[in-house]
């Protein structure tokens, strides 16, 4: 662990209450193929424990979705990954909209610091799939 | 190689016969920019030779495709990446559908073990592009 | 740096003049969360300074876009990432079209050599978003 190989891959636990757009994650071998090795979960949100540059990746699939599902709704469905605490470091890191599609997937490199908590906000009224091969979120430390 | 930096990037060779949804891959410098350094190919399927956590990524583009191509067909076109052997470890790792789109691309972290064979199943009746910049599949060992 | 951990994450600076399909990138902590550690920018294009296998990733979002924006235009909007110089190594590495979608995102492993300059060509007449969480481009050295 001293090499700084912090890494995590999470699966969706549940969505938040109505006014909370955050997705709540879970991880651990007992749950399937998700795991946390270094980072930790704080009430379903991912907290970084080691400074460095990380590869952040995410895939979110909407539940029982067809290409018309996303266009049927007036409010666009958007997924944003960002640092939500500490407040002084709050920023959106990655943002995608579901445009007549049912899945978004992306990745990016970003500097993260010990104590940064990442939030994944799904705006709109569509429910995400909890299937572990359709919706997942992970980080990988790549260098100091 | 003792560092465990197993890595592979493959290009599409061909699709299977009608009842076989698997894509068959090939790799090697003579073919272009694909390569295998550690993992190996077994009849077009990727076999892992070192335990660890891997970043698995894939992009598949449908051949001569427009936004209506995917909606034209009754059966949805879906790509799933999974462990197909040994049977005791069979599981779907990553799944995406082409919803009025012509390309899917995603990536995820997952634990893999020596001997795991990864299959990429394309369901539906649309032919994938063999262009090496449009369709590719790869794995990268990231930590033990 | 001697470990060869070359890495860069760039944000969009501007598009080229009409006959130049290239996107012009910028990076550095003063600009936000973009950075260059090893690779360098040459007139907005990313130049590699160390041989090796790299993970190349990109996300491009079209500005003020809805699902009809991309289908409204006769010429398809396509993003291609390739080596544009030296001319002897010119090749397309990764290509995606916006089919009734507003964002493309993908990644791949590819061998790159010192002096390779990567270009990101956006064909079509739609303007990309400059928001740093919507459009970004990066490379990460992963092994020799």
């Amino acid at each position: 662990e001293s090499l700084g190989w912090d890494i995590a891959e999470l699966q969706l636990n549940h969505t938040g209450p109505q006014q909370d757009p955050r997705l709540y994650w879970q991880g651990g071998p007992a749950l399937g193929r998700s795991f946390l090795r270094g980072p930790e979960l704080d009430k379903g949100q991912l907290r970084i424990r080691r400074d460095g540059i990380y590869m952040v990746h995410i895939q979110v699939t909407l539940a029982i979705c067809s290409s018309t599902s996303t266009s049927r709704h007036h409010h666009p469905t958007t997924l944003a990954v960002g640092i939500c605490s500490p407040a002084s470091r709050s920023i959106s890191l990655l943002r995608l909209s579901f445009h007549q599609g049912c899945t978004i997937a992306s990745q990016r490199l970003t500097p993260l610091a010990r104590g940064d908590t990442l939030c994944t906000n799904l705006t709109g009224t569509l429910l995400p799939s909890r299937n572990t091969d359709e919706t997942f979120f992970g980080v990988q430390w790549v260098r100091p | 190689e003792s560092l465990g930096w197993d890595i592979a990037e493959l290009q599409l060779n061909h699709t299977g016969p009608q009842q076989d949804p698997r894509l068959y891959w090939q790799g090697g410098p003579a073919l272009g920019r694909s390569f295998l350094r550690g993992p190996e190919l077994d009849k077009g399927q990727l076999r892992i030779r070192r335990d660890g956590i891997y970043m698995v990524h894939i992009q598949v583009t449908l051949a001569i495709c427009s936004s209506t191509s995917t909606s034209r067909h009754h059966h949805p076109t879906t790509l799933a990446v999974g462990i197909c052997s040994p049977a005791s470890r069979s599981i779907s790792l990553l799944r995406l559908s082409f919803h009025q789109g012509c390309t899917i691309a995603s990536q995820r972290l997952t634990p893999l073990a020596r001997g795991d064979t990864l299959c990429t199943n394309l369901t539906g009746t649309l032919l994938p592009s063999r262009n090496t910049d449009e369709t590719f599949f790869g794995v990268q060992w990231v930590r033990p | 740096e001697s470990l060869g951990w070359d890495i860069a994450e760039l944000q969009l600076n501007h598009t080229g003049p009409q006959q130049d399909p290239r996107l012009y990138w910028q990076g550095g902590p003063a600009l936000g969360r973009s950075f260059l550690r090893g690779p360098e920018l040459d007139k907005g294009q990313l130049r590699i300074r160390r041989d090796g296998i790299y993970m190349v990733h990109i996300q491009v979002t079209l500005a003020i876009c809805s699902s009809t924006s991309t289908s409204r235009h006769h010429h398809p909007t396509t993003l291609a990432v390739g080596i544009c110089s030296p001319a002897s190594r010119s090749i397309s590495l990764l290509r995606l079209s916006f089919h009734q979608g507003c964002t493309i995102a993908s990644q791949r492993l590819t061998p790159l050599a010192r002096g390779d300059t990567l270009c990101t060509n956006l064909t079509g007449t739609l303007l990309p978003s400059r928001n740093t969480d919507e459009t970004f481009f990066g490379v990460q050295w992963v092994r020799p």
Epitope: - | L12, A63, G124, L126 | -
Partner: antibody
Framework: QVQLKQSGPGLVQPSQSLSITCTVS????????VHWVRQSPGKGLEWLGV???????DYNAAFISRLTISKDNSKSQVFFKMNSLQADDTAIYYC??????????????WGQGTSVTVSS | DIVLTQSPASLPVSLGQRATISCRAN??????????MHWYQQKPGQPPKLLIY???NLDSGVPARFSGSGSGTDFTLNIHPVEEEDTATYYC?????????FGAGTKLELK
Amino acid sequence: QVQLKQSGPGLVQPSQSLSITCTVSNFSLSTYGVHWVRQSPGKGLEWLGVIWGGGYTDYNAAFISRLTISKDNSKSQVFFKMNSLQADDTAIYYCARNNYYGNLYAMDYWGQGTSVTVSS
Amino acid sequence: DIVLTQSPASLPVSLGQRATISCRANKSVSASGYSFMHWYQQKPGQPPKLLIYLASNLDSGVPARFSGSGSGTDFTLNIHPVEEEDTATYYCQHSREFPLTFGAGTKLELK
């Protein structure tokens, strides 16, 4: 074995419409597309249009204003209707199944053909 | 529309010899790593029969004496050795874009 059987009139009056039914067996119309092609001594083989598993259609732009292709999956039938026929529409009309790959657009099984003469 | 030009229009061949039929497109029909050219055989009073798809793939049940090659704009159908039952008209067809178009045909006859 896969079969496509066509039924329709042999003689059509000028300016009238042509209707042909293609009844298929041993494959599903919800999976496979069905093309329509005609053949005449003067123009050779001409592709007219196709109806896909999902019910979507693609037409040859030269015929789009007077051609309709539809189907009834439950009856395994595809319907072809062309309006405003003229003498140069005299031809043998074929239905043909799209090859397994939906974006390949090759035709692997054909109906026996319907010989149509446009004449008063 | 893509125009396909077949040559020759008529091809007399002796039994056991090689027959070579050419099909040229006025623009490339190759894309996505494939060549979207197909070949059909038609005998009098019968509908066309698919022989080869994607330039070189034999359809099921087609004898191995049939082979196809080519890419871009130039394609070839070879029959070797020619047998008596191969007397027919052969058509090429592209599927690179709509509308699909066919060549005018090559009539293979025995010398």
